[in-house]
Amino acid sequence: DTHKSEVAHRFKDLGEEHFKGLVLVAFSQYLQQCPFEEHVKLVNEVTEFAKTCVADESAENCDKSLHTLFGDKLCTVATLRETYGEMADCCAKQEPERNECFLQHKDDNPNLPPLVRPEVDVMCTAFHDNEATFLKKYLYEVARRHPYFYAPELLFFAARYKAAFAECCQAADKAACLLPKLDELRDEGKASSAKQRLKCASLQKFGDRAFKAWAVARLSQKFPKAEFAEVSKLVTDLTKVHTECCHGDLLECADDRADLAKYMCENQDSISSKLKECCDKPLLEKSHCLAEVENDEMPADLPSLAADYVESKDVCKNYAEAKDVFLGMFLYEYARRHPDYSVMLLLRLAKAYEATLEKCCAAADPHECYAKVFDEFQPLVEEPQNLVKQNCELFEQLGEYKFQNALLVRYTKKVPQVSTPTLVEVSRNLGKVGAKCCKLPEAKRMPCAEDYLSVVLNRLCVLHEKTPVSEKVTKCCTESLVNRRPCFSALELDEAYVPKAFNAETFTFHADMCTLSEKEKQVKKQTALVELVKHKPKATKEQLKGVMDNFAAFVEKCCKADDKEACFAEEGPKFVAASQAALA
């Protein structure tokens, strides 16, 4: 399906509004430090050019690829070398190497200030004064901080952002209406970004076979009534969509995602009974709804898997004829029967099944060799079940903050070389698994917990790749995507680690602590806890709990004092001395 002008094709398919939004997202994700105005200028230039191509597809340069057009435009930025350093060298390359070069320079942890939320009246005024600029600014600010954000989904977030302001800026109590909506968008946005980052890591680090396996398992859980051929078609299309978005081909990605939504809604009967509600919605909402749709009910009469995959004498013949298709069918059949398993567990089972067939199909008596293959699954299933059971027990015992602290101690002991801000961020997010998953019924706990942990641990892997400091982290992150979480779970205390020297400055606190929000206070205390474990990695949990209780009491006391700063100056050194004695 070739077009004389790719840019004209995408402009016509997507429409001007989505075209401009996606180009802005693409540019912001590549050049994360550029000012907003610069990006708007580039987007307007590209849009004007696209319109000339729509008018005449044979016009000059209209036949160029989108990478060539966009790359040429990015390379016109005057301050490229000063702002981005070696990224400027990408501009000396030809396509497709130039785009690959830009992709490699995407920064998962850009040095950008945290977004501060202005007063509600200030935001409403800005929204009313120039709605278009206000929404573009949202796309820009999110995209530059989240360079792998799923672009068509970001357009959906922007539409919700717009709707929130349109509604709440008219409300009697603007803040009461708007702030919860903005909090929800922020939290959902961070979660969406992290989930997409795992998809991109899966494609880029482990290849499309890994992503397709993930998609087969997930879609088979969602659509257990669909035939294998139908699931395979959806997997192929979904893989194309995510490959494009992760590769920076945002216009193609959004266009293909719209096509996939259209296909799913036209073929609901052979996919799932749960799609109907989604399919009545407008495009962005429809695609989001389809992606989040609940699992359909399992067919009532599914036969045992053993007949085709263990008892049959043709297992090795069927496997040899088309290995990936046979394994794909096994994964599909297992996943549609097990919505109670995490996708990662299902992939481990498929991997174990594959390893058994590789070994047994070369043996003297293959059937005898693989007869007990399903028994070998038991420990693989029990491991995440135990993990969820134990950690939910601890979460219920401690509550979220103290559960996060337990994870901070656990992960600092495992990988003490990792930077303190990364350990705090990752452990706080790991700790959120409790509130998110532990309240769910038993059948939903494992898929919720383990698949969420995979997303959070991917963030650790992505940050660590930028600045590698631990061989253990590198090993867990790179050896196997599906075994990342069990690899981290199995890590023991790092005996080779040389404890960090005591630095009084790290444990010096001031009166400004008292004016911090509850979340900021927690982060300060958790930062100190990580530093404490790095200084005393063999401290027991009871010792650390005692120190943290004393710390909370010390801060509370000084924040209640008349002269807060004097209290911190006097009580701080006493607290540090008492803590050192307790941990000696």
Epitope: N386, K389, Q390, E393, L394, Q397, A406, R410, K413, S489, A490, L491, E492, L493, T540, K541, E542, K545
Partner: nanobody
């Protein structure tokens, strides 16, 4: 401080049985989970089994499942490891450990207190 003392180790033939005990003194034993770990000669210490504070959840290493049983008697401040169908590869120093969370984790660093160990040798 919790003090833990293991007993019951010794020399046993393959296929035989042993019962290890772990006597605790100090704070209330019933608030701690208990774990058994072992260190085979020339190898790392490894998880064997654990039991939570109330005794209603038990966990086992795959290598001992079906052969070993962990239990506890909170009234006696004692934990037990019943080992049967012993194999030469079970030869190790066995350690008892207490976990203040009361959960019974698989990782050794989660345990706050440790006994000195008791030798188990399985040989004909």
């Amino acid at each position: 401080q919790v003090q833990l003392v293991e007993s019951g180790g010794g020399l046993v033939q393959p296929g035989g049985s042993l019962r290890l005990s772990c006597a605790a003194s100090g704070p209330i034993f019933s608030t701690y989970a208990m774990g058994w770990f072992r260190q085979p000669p020339g190898k790392e210490r490894e998880f064997v089994a654990s039991i939570n504070r109330s005794g209603d959840s038990t966990y086992y290493a795959d290598s001992v499942k079906g052969r070993f049983t962990i239990s506890r008697d909170n009234a006696k401040n004692t934990g037990y490891l019943q080992m049967s169908s012993l194999k030469p590869e079970d030869t190790a120093v066995y350690y008892c450990a207490a976990d203040s969370d009361g959960i019974g984790w698989f990782n050794s660093f989660e345990y706050d207190y440790w006994g000195r160990g008791t030798q188990v040798t399985v040989s004909s």
